[in-house]
Interface confidence: medium
């Protein structure tokens, strides 16, 4: 039975050409993260595995940076990078769970982070 | 250039134990993980685990897991891998790989130890 | 386990014909998927990564594509060096898994 729930940054906004991390926090389970992947829609950026480490997509690797934890810092943001990010947590023996955060890059000056929200 | 030279084949014995090793050569051994993989009748492809040389972390298949030993020397930047209680089902092609540092897609081969268990 | 399926494990064809091969996931592996080309008595050597990104060196010959479960190789003009067999693998979460391999011959 799957009892963790994953905590995330929820929608945050940010100046474009600036940078924002992402976020994803699992508790509520003693489950083992073996893996934990960060996508962007359909496309991956990046996997932090619990034993091997970080690896960056390529299509990412010179405005990702892996980090704070097993959080993602997106650099250099465009109004492209508005969308749905997802944090994909690999667990034993609970299995997957899935995260979003809504990310919205503003052209103004002013950029207020969201409140933080739980799925479960 | 990046090279991954490994050890030559080996003929061994049912329930005895082999260990390949993968020298490498041209570039930073501790920033890229090695991974093993073994091929059976010249077709399909499994992993059997990957390390980071950088700290020890050992990844495993768990089919190979408890069979499998993945270890690195850093001192000569060579990977090793030990495979104990061997059956005939073990007899392969055996490849040392290593990825890119962008994802788990294996760039670099090398050319591969052939394992034959037989009494 | 995540399984890789290569439907096809023999293709055959003609030089300058175009080829798909094709490979499915068992469960959704979003663009991390690689392709594979394995000559008689090779080691098997990286064409397509991350889906779509041909790796340094590979001729433009060689595209792919798809995203989730449903993945393409394609050559778009066959040539006689390209028989082999041509392996998928997702490295989307561990344990990394290969497809049967598709065995490109040509007629």
């Known amino acids: 039975m799957m009892t963790g729930t994953i905590e995330t940054t929820g929608n945050i906004s940010a100046e474009k050409g600036g940078s924002i991390i992402l976020q994803c926090h699992l508790s509520s389970t003693t489950a083992q993260v073996t893996q934990v992947n960060w996508a962007q829609q359909d496309q991956l950026l990046a996997i932090c595995n619990a034993d091997l480490g970080w690896h960056i997509s390529p299509s990412f690797k010179d405005r990702v940076a892996p980090g704070p934890g097993l959080g993602l810092t997106l650099q250099s943001l465009t109004v492209n990078d508005t969308g749905e990010y997802f944090c994909i947590y690999h667990t034993y023996p609970d299995g997957t769970y899935t995260g979003r955060i809504f990310l919205e890059v503003l052209e103004s000056s002013v950029a207020e982070h969201g409140a933080r929200f739980q799925i479960p | 250039e990046v090279q991954l030279q490994q050890s030559g084949p080996e003929l061994v014995k049912p329930g005895a134990s082999v260990k390949i090793s993968c020298k490498t050569s041209?570039?930073?051994?501790?920033?890229?993980?090695m991974h093993w993989v073994k091929q059976s009748h010249g077709k399909n492809l499994e992993w059997i685990g990957g390390?980071?040389?950088?700290?020890?972390?050992?990844s495993y298949n768990q089919k190979f897991k408890g069979r499998a030993t993945l270890t690195v020397d850093k001192s000569s930047s060579t990977a090793y891998m030990e495979l104990r209680s061997l059956t005939s089902d073990d007899s392969a092609v055996y490849y040392c790989?290593?990825?890119?540092?962008?994802?788990?897609?294996?760039?670099?081969w090398g050319q591969g130890t052939s394992v034959t268990v037989s009494s | 386990d995540i399984v890789m399926t290569q439907s096809h494990k023999f293709m055959s064809t003609s030089v300058g014909d175009r080829v798909n091969i094709t490979c499915k996931a068992s469960q959704g592996v979003s663009t991390a998927v690689a392709w594979y080309q394995q000559k008689p008595g090779q080691s098997p050597k990286l064409l397509i990564y991350?889906?779509?990104y041909r790796y340094t060196g590979v001729p433009d010959r060689f595209t792919g594509s798809g995203s989730g479960t449903d993945f393409t190789f394609t050559i778009s003009s066959v040539q006689a060096e390209d028989l082999a067999v041509y392996h998928c693998?997702?490295?989307?979460?561990?344990?990394?898994?290969f497809g049967g391999g598709t065995k490109l011959e040509i007629k």
């Open positions: 390390i980071n040389p950088n700290n020890g972390g050992t």
């Open positions: 790989a290593r990825p890119g540092w962008y994802n788990y897609a294996m760039d670099y």
């Open positions: 991350s889906a779509s």
């Open positions: 041209g570039y930073t051994f501790t920033e890229y993980t």
């Open positions: 693998q997702q490295h989307y979460i561990t344990p990394w898994t």
